[in-house]
Interface confidence: low
């Protein structure tokens, strides 16, 4: 139904607390450099305006679209041009062009210091002084660093953060109570951010059809007892919610998400028995619980897929008459039977099936042509299985740090033009997938690995689009969303790359490395490793092992020495010469 005042309607639906949080997130995700105080001032102004509209929906400007009201607020900021440069040019445009222009200026990699966690004592003092302001600051700091974070989920994490502080600030040992809780929230929130970023990229770069296919596969795995029509209804609503959040319409997104959760709870009998435990929870927790829900058990007696998709004489007729519905049904039926496959695998299988029908349905004897389609799709299952098996074996053999090093070498060879810090960052992220997934049972390993890789490669693609340096990376990122991972896997040594000249500075170390925390020490060593591969991209595994062994021995010797700096000064050049000889 149409509302006289959209902003009043959303304020009423969401309540003041969530409304203010979402306004703060909206502003922080668009104006990532502005200080917290400036945002607080704007949030209060927007909230007062919304309250006035609740009192009188016909009041001046209350009938405007929320995006327009936000745009007007942003464009009224006096320091906009000096702080944000060309973002201010958006203000010369009319909506909806102005909204699109703001979106294009969101920075996925803002130049902000890492979000450091203060000491527990300081945290608790600040929290007790003013907990609303404290939680507001958390929303602001996360939002400006993650401009596509799923806003209603961020409200959920803020609530978890608040609960952890409420409990632990009363504990005798605050640190022991807080650290594990905050670490867990941080880890989950980072994954949530990456998942939403992939959804937004899927919609923005590959269109609604790609996102809907992704959603059909995911929901069919989670709710295998639901009918295809039910899955389709949920997918349609979910697409609307996701588009709104990705587009920056966070009040609409959060409100519609609440509606979707309500719908699913009202229809839980025809969706999943697992919804019961979610549907008794309050709003934020309910939607989060549904998002994270365990998959339902498979229905018994599911017929063989071949019955409807190979043996049925009407396959080509069904395909021709309602292509998307027929393929959607195929994806649904395949996905609900295979909870152990990754989304990417399921979508590649559906794509392979579609390609086969495109070809066969144009032939004289279509059935003879597609009769063996499931056998022909088998390599799409074998390839990732084999790859996961090999990489987990390597991970088990080398451990996380050694596995990261192997990946650093592998990815530097694939895309040596990418900057050294970026390659190290991705090698480390890819390496941590081993820790997350390789210890899981066989049935979960495959989907865990490929689903995580999709998130990591999406981040790589987004940052690479901002400053493209490698044609091969661009090709893998843009040609097909579902084939990104196989495309990167298929890349090997870039034969067109001209090796980087040797710079002794890249391999010069000082005594300060000895006092660094273990993680930072590893990063420094991995930077040197990447530089080494850029210098000698075709060095053999043996040569690399020798060099890394010499390097580790050198660090150990000098860090154990009484006069560390003297050791580094004296032995450093010898090590460099030795490495050059090994790699010659």
């Amino acid at each position: 139904e149409a509302h006289k005042s959209e902003i009043a309607h959303r304020f009423n639906d969401l309540g003041e607390g969530h409304f203010k949080g979402l306004v703060l997130i909206t502003l922080s995700q668009h104006l990532q450099k502005s200080p917290f105080e400036e945002h607080v001032k704007l949030v209060n102004e927007v909230t007062d305006f919304a309250k006035a509209c609740v009192a009188d929906e016909s009041a001046q400007n209350c009938g405007k679209a929320i995006a327009t009201l936000f745009g007007d607020k942003v464009c009224a900021i006096p320091s906009l041009r000096e702080t944000y440069g060309e973002l201010a040019d958006c203000c010369a445009k009319e909506d909806p062009d102005r909204v699109e222009c703001f979106l294009q200026h969101k920075d996925d990699n803002p130049n902000l210091p890492p979000f450091e966690r203060p000491e527990p004592e300081a945290l608790c003092t600040a929290f007790k002084e003013n907990n609303d302001r404290f939680i507001g600051h958390y929303l602001y700091e996360v939002s400006r660093r993650h401009p596509y974070f799923y806003a209603p989920e961020l409200l959920y994490y803020a609530e978890k953060y608040k609960n952890a502080l409420t409990e632990c600030c009363e504990a005798a040992d605050k640190a022991a109570c807080l650290t594990p809780k905050l670490d867990a929230i941080k880890e989950k929130a980072l994954v949530s951010s990456a998942q939403q970023r992939l959804k937004c990229a899927s919609l923005q770069k590959f269109g609604e059809r790609a996102f809907k296919a992704w959603s059909v596969a995911r929901l069919s795995q989670k709710f295998p007892k639901a009918e295809f029509a039910e899955i389709s209804t949920i997918v349609t609503s979910l697409t609307k919610v996701t588009k709104e959040c990705c587009h920056g319409d966070l009040l609409e997104c959060a409100d519609d998400r609440q509606e979707l959760a309500k719908y699913m709870c009202e229809h839980q009998d025809s969706i999943s028995s697992k919804l019961k435990e979610c549907c008794v929870k309050p709003t934020l927790q309910k939607a989060h619980c549904i998002l994270e829900i365990q998959r339902d058990e498979l229905p018994t007696e599911l017929p063989d897929l071949a019955v409807d998709f190979v043996e049925d004489k009407e396959v080509c007729k069904n395909f021709a008459e309602a292509k998307d519905v027929f393929l959607g049904t195929f994806l649904y039926e395949y996905s609900r039977r295979h909870p152990e496959y990754s989304i990417g695998m399921l979508l590649r299988i559906a794509k392979g099936y579609e390609a086969k029908l495109e070809k066969c349905c144009a032939e004289a004897d279509p059935h003879a042509c597609y009769a063996k389609v499931f056998d022909e799709l088998q390599p799409l299952i074998d390839e990732p299985k084999k790859l996961v098996q090999q990489n987990c074996e390597l991970f088990d053999k080398l451990g996380e740090y050694g596995f990261q090093n192997a990946l650093a070498v592998r990815y530097t060879q694939k895309a040596p033009q990418v900057s050294t810090p970026t390659l190290v960052e991705y090698a480390r992220k890819l390496g941590s997938v081993g820790t997350k997934c390789c210890s899981l049972p066989e049935t979960e390993r495959l989907s865990c690995t490929e689903n995580y890789l999709a998130l990591i490669l999406n981040r790589l693609c987004i940052l690479h689009e901002k400053t493209p340096v490698s044609e091969r990376v661009t090709k893998c990122c843009t040609e097909s969303l579902v084939n990104r991972r196989p495309c990167f896997s298929a890349l090997h040594v870039d034969e067109t790359y001209v090796p980087k000249p040797f710079h002794a500075d890249s391999f010069t170390f000082h005594a300060d490395i000895c006092t660094l925390p273990e993680k930072e020490k590893q990063v420094k060593k991995q930077m040197a490793l990447v530089e080494l591969v850029k210098h000698k991209p075709k060095a053999s595994e043996e040569q690399m092992k020798t060099v890394m062994g010499d390097f580790a021995a050198f660090l150990k010797k000098c860090c154990d020495a009484d006069n560390k700096e003297a050791c580094f000064t004296e032995d450093g050049p010898k090590l460099v010469a030795k490495c050059q000889a090994t790699l010659a």
Epitope: G352, A355, P384, P486, A490, L491, H492, V493, D494, K538
Partner: nanobody, 115 residues
């Protein structure tokens, strides 16, 4: 357009050898790993072997390890599969593919091992 043309198949006796070739065009050959897959009569597709873009890394299915050798000539943009000590169970149509992608398979070349 991407094109993969396999050749070199034929009828051989068990224990003998054959060398398959796959001429590739329409894409940057050196940028991609390549694979051989095969399909025995009435069976599904089976992955046989893969090789990296530079040719430095190779991978084999257990059933062919020690008997088959995959190689490539990047100058000629051609992929090879040297098959020694052939067995009746190696009878199949052999296809070369780009990476693990099915949509880029050639027409295949038939290998029959029989006495």
């Amino acid at each position: 357009d991407v094109q993969l043309v396999e050749s070199g198949g034929g009828v051989v006796q068990p224990g003998n050898s054959l060398r398959l070739s796959c001429a590739a065009s329409g894409f940057t050959f050196t940028s991609f790993g390549m694979s051989w897959v095969r399909q025995a009569p009435g069976k599904g597709l089976e992955w046989v072997s893969s090789i990296s873009g530079s040719g430095s890394d190779t991978l084999y299915a257990d059933s062919v390890k020690g008997r088959f050798t995959i190689s490539r000539d990047n100058a000629k943009t051609t992929l090879y599969l040297q098959m020694n000590s052939l067995r009746p169970e190696d009878t199949a149509t052999y296809y070369c593919t780009i990476g693990g992608s099915l949509s880029r398979s050639g027409q295949g070349t038939l290998v029959t091992v029989s006495s």
